[in-house]
Interface confidence: medium
């Protein structure tokens, strides 16, 4: 005769308030004859949850028909779960006896715990922008989850990061927990289009982690490089000087031209282009009248980027005698 086994496959069952919980229990033998009862707890204070033969259990229903002759499934459903329902549930086989049934064998128990999903992770970056090669910190927070076990990972453009610190609070027993993690990220010059991702995995999410993202474009400042050049060709009595402001981010930029230290107010032509990496290039053209110029003209292109200290590049204008002659000729 096969020895009776009481099989409760789930060690832990996470349930949500208001939902229905299914507690599984199957037996491997129909013998000995006698009922299967459900209890919460095993000690003297254990509580009867379901007895097919007697009692009133309005929130409990059976998964299969217990009146069927060969039934071996004694699983139950408990509806409208509340926090008071947490505990370990045991299905227990009793052997028919006189004057009363005798407890024969218990299942290993299924612990019912309240599960709560973590909130969508919120990722916050630094308050101020930082230049490449420097380290910035990002924080990720998620709240309201239970049980306490949770996994958090950081990614930058799909590559997992390792430099981070994570805390789950509180450390003791609680109805719900919060996680906070701070990751340190070294900025690269091409990070304008980069993203950091905080990924949270929890048993309540059934293998589908939650993600929070932050764009490094909010955290990075790529300072421009400046180049001032004089175009070899002149247009009539004017020489074209170009100031090229390359590879900067964000777009916020002020450019001014100075001629021998005097700021020029007149309009200049300019173009803004966006690079593949998300940085910008700005080109400004400045036309200098050379008809009445001396040899010592110094042009300065000054750029103030994103509220930082101004940077400038100077160019001593080369006006050849030939050009001067040409311009003299051109003067009526």
């Amino acid at each position: 005769e096969e020895e009776l086994q009481m099989i409760q496959p789930e060690k832990l069952l996470l349930v949500t308030v208001g939902k229905t919980a299914t507690l599984h229990c199957t037996v491997t033998s129909l013998l000995p004859v006698g009922p299967v009862l459900w209890f919460r707890g095993v000690g003297p204070g254990r509580e009867l949850i379901y007895n097919q033969k007697e009692g009133h259990f309005p929130r409990v229903t059976t998964v299969s028909d217990l009146t069927k002759r060969n039934n071996m499934d004694f699983s139950i459903r408990i509806s409208s779960i509340t926090p008071a329902d947490v505990g370990t549930y045991y299905c227990v086989k009793f052997r028919k006896g006189s004057p009363e049934n005798v407890e024969f064998k218990s299942g290993p128990g299924t612990e019912m715990a309240l599960g709560a999903k973590p909130s969508a992770p919120v990722v916050l970056g630094p308050a101020a922008r930082t230049t490449p090669e420097h380290t910035v910190s990002f924080t990720c927070e998620s709240h309201g989850f239970s049980p306490r076990d949770i996994t958090l990972k950081w990614f930058k453009n799909g590559n997992e990061l390792s430099d981070f610190q994570t805390n789950v609070d509180p450390t003791g027993q609680s109805v719900a927990y919060s996680i906070r993690s701070t990751a340190r990220v070294v900025l690269d010059p091409w990070d304008v289009r980069s993203q950091v991702i905080c990924e949270v995995a929890h048993v309540t999410l059934q293998g589908d982690p939650l993600r929070g993202t932050a764009n490094l474009s909010e955290a990075i400042r790529v300072p421009p490089t400046l180049e001032v050049t004089q175009q070899p060709m002149r247009v009539g009595n004017q020489v074209n000087v170009t100031c090229q402001v390359r590879k900067f981010y964000p777009q916020s930029l002020q450019l001014t031209w100075s001629e021998n230290g005097n700021v020029c107010q007149r309009e200049t032509a300019s173009t803004l282009t966006e690079n593949k990496d998300g940085t910008y290039n700005w080109t400004s053209w400045f036309l200098v009248n050379i008809s009445d110029q001396r040899d010592d003209v110094v042009l300065t292109c000054q750029v103030k980027h994103d509220g930082q200290l101004a940077v400038s590049k100077r160019l001593a204008l080369e006006v050849t005698v030939h050009q001067k002659d040409q311009s003299s000729d051109a003067t009526p």
Partner: antibody
Amino acid sequence: QSVEESGGRLVTPGTPLTLACTVSGFSLISYYISWVRQAPEKGLEYIGIINIGGGASYASWAKGRFTISKTSTTVDLKITSPTPEDTATYFCAMSYGMDTGAFNIWGPGTLVTVSL
Amino acid sequence: AQVLTQTPASVSAAVGGTVTISCQSSESVYKNNFLSWYQQKPGKPPKLLIYGASTLASGVPSRFKGSGSGTQFTLTISDLESDDAATYFCQGGYRTDIYPFGGGTEVVVK
């Protein structure tokens, strides 16, 4: 009517150890057996409880560290991976004929020493 | 986790005197009365004195009295005898199927 523990000895850390609680002189429809330990010069520490049907539950600190099981003649306590902090006298205690969580029959205890 | 706080940790009284030990639970015990008291002497296992908060165990003299309900319990030993010198523990039973002990109170009889 008595319970008696056995199996206590000197073990090295990490070596699993199983203690047995033998019940004699009882013919009961329902009873519960609890394992309790007492470190030298310290108080009583509840480990867990098992009923006649073999259903067991544990103190939260003891989950995973101990396993209580029932055979036809004994109730066993397995210390899965002992550490020096598990050095104590281990008692099994029986509750019968009452439904108040009290343990009215205690064994003399068995000493477990965990040391290198 | 449920915690039972016993006070005082040690108490001394003369033969014929009275000793009162308090046991406070961090949450209500099951059915408000799942509270037991034990006496333990050195080298011996604990002995049940009172169960159900106030019921005297078999063979225990009526000098021992248990009272209280819910979270607050008291053991009173009157007409103290030298044989009462021991450590006394309270034990609670909870709905979550946990049966922890208090920290113990040493009773010294002068």
